[in-house]
């Protein structure tokens, strides 16, 4: 059951984080203009990682995509391709981790398929996360760097009366959504990892077998109870003993069958 | 076509208070941002009031700020201007205005004469 | 506050004769997003309100003749009249609309010589 809650909660939080990452790749407000010297700017303009715009007090917005490919920064074509590994990483582990799901039946499938199914998907969760982490930060470094440069040359023409205010650019929302999304597919991933343990076949199973001391006789009555980690299941079937005690698959075939010796 | 028709001027104390109404046809008053412009006689113009579309904004400049409030009733297709504390120099004609692209006034109504004088 | 100079501040000239006009702000109305320059040329006749002529220094309004041109960038702009007719006979302002508050040059009366 705890595995069952474990692999869906992984699912449904990795679920979410790459809506997320899908969503912060597609938001406009990657960086936005900074407001500090002029809160009450006429004309706002914001940026994202395949067009810029601006919006006009009156209510207009424009935006323009970036169609030139080359003429980019690196920088902004290495997040753009870590925020699409991310994705395409992401979307990937969504579609093994809805096969890996103990509580969807595929044919015949074994347990063991499933639990490495699950962990495939947990890493790729894992590392779609930290693409989107990676991404989000390596922009977030670019418009720190950008921002300090143009503080120091904030105005950059000084003849006279004249002066150009140099447009700073600061956080948008995109990011804090990269972050949050990216940490949550984290988590999803870890948990995918977590409950593949649980959903692993386990060679030996100890069984509990209970002993009645009457006199001198002793009696043992059989009991499908594991003695192990409570996740594994006995694939093999292995009998203890063979007049007595069974595996728990056993006990559940026969219910009303008891064995004494 | 659209128009813009400004009412509520006239003559006050230095002092006192009125609201200056416009309002609006024939074009989709709820997705413009509205200003108020001034004109002194024989004076160059000034802006006065800016309320963004979804009455979330507004923008004034030092000169009637505290004193002036913009707003609007989308539903009544109305833009209002209360003027509190009224001095001699903002005796103007008063003007709505629609803005535009590029932030610029589109649409103008006639103006309102506002005399402010004891 | 951003400061708007208009010159002249009245200009006579010849009907079908060029007429050009200049304003100057203070700081640069560039927008750096969208590479446009906020400024908005308006014609005012007497006893009328003001008419958008052309925004973003250059566009013209709909409905506007095509002999009034908007040119210039940053600080220095030109509304040029490329051939005066009569009914061009007005004052012409020039407006930042790039930063609040929005600020009106002084305006410059147009004449027939």
């Known amino acids: 059951m705890a595995v069952t809650a474990c692999q869906g909660l992984g699912f449904v939080v990795s679920l979410i984080g790459i809506a997320g990452i899908i969503a912060a790749t597609c938001m406009d407000q990657w960086s936005t203009q900074d407001l500090y010297n002029n809160p009450v700017t006429a004309v706002f303009n914001y940026q994202g990682l395949w067009r810029s715009c601006v919006r006009e007090s009156s209510g207009f917005t424009e935006c323009r995509g970036y169609f030139t490919l080359l003429g980019l920064p690196a920088m902004l074509q290495a997040v753009r391709a870590l925020m699409i590994v991310g994705i395409v990483l992401g979307a990937i582990g969504l579609l093994v981790s809805i096969f890996a799901l103990k509580c969807i039946r595929i044919g015949s499938m074994e347990d063991s398929a499933k639990a490495n199914m699950t962990l495939t998907s947990g890493i790729m969760f894992i590392v779609s996360g930290l693409c989107a982490i990676a991404g989000v930060s390596v922009f977030a470094n670019m418009l720190v760097t950008n921002f300090w440069m143009s503080t120091a040359n904030m105005y950059t023409g000084m003849g006279g009366m004249v002066q150009t205010v140099q447009t700073r650019y600061t956080f948008g929302a995109a990011l804090f959504v990269g972050w949050v999304a990216g940490g949550l597919t984290l988590i999803g991933g870890v948990m995918m990892c977590i409950a593949c343990r649980g959903l692993a076949p386990e060679e030996t199973n100890y069984k509990a077998v209970s002993y009645h001391a009457s006199g001198h006789s002793v009696a043992y009555k059989p009991g499908g109870f594991k003695a192990s980690t409570g996740f594994g299941s006995n694939t093999k079937n292995k009998k203890i003993y063979d007049g007595g005690a069974r595996t728990e698959d056993e006990v559940q075939s026969y219910p009303s069958k008891h064995d004494y010796v | 076509e659209v128009q813009l028709l400004e009412s509520g001027g006239g003559l006050v104390q230095p002092g006192g208070s009125l609201r200056l109404s416009c309002a609006a046809s024939e074009f989709t008053f709820s997705n413009y941002a509205m200003s108020w412009v001034r004109q002194a006689p024989g004076k160059r113009l000034e802006w006065v009031a800016t309320i963004s579309s979804g009455r979330s904004s507004t923008y004034y400049p030092d000169s009637v700020k505290g004193r002036f409030t913009i707003s609007r009733d989308n539903s009544k297709n109305t833009l209002y201007l209360q003027m509190n504390s009224l001095r001699a120099e903002d005796t103007a004609v008063y003007y709505c205005?629609?803005?535009?692209?590029?932030?610029?006034?589109?649409?103008w109504g006639q103006g309102t004469l506002v005399t402010v004088s004891s | 506050d951003i400061v708007m100079t208009q010159s002249p501040d009245s200009l006579a000239v010849s009907l079908g004769e060029r007429a050009t006009i200049s304003c100057k702000s203070s700081q640069s109305l560039l927008n750096s997003g969208n590479q446009k320059n906020y400024l908005t040329w308006y014609q005012q006749k007497p006893g009328q309100p003001p008419k958008l002529l052309i925004y973003?220094?250059?566009t013209r309004e709909s409905g506007v003749p095509d002999r009034f041109t908007g040119s210039g960038s940053g600080t220095d702009f030109t509304l040029t009249i490329s051939s005066l007719q009569a009914e061009d006979v007005a004052v012409y302002y020039c407006?930042?609309?790039?930063?609040?508050?929005?600020?009106f040059g002084g305006g410059t009366k147009l004449e027939i010589k």
């Open positions: 205005a629609g803005l535009g692209r590029g932030n610029a006034m589109e649409y």
């Open positions: 407006q930042n609309a790039y930063s609040y508050p929005f600020t």
């Open positions: 973003w220094a250059s």
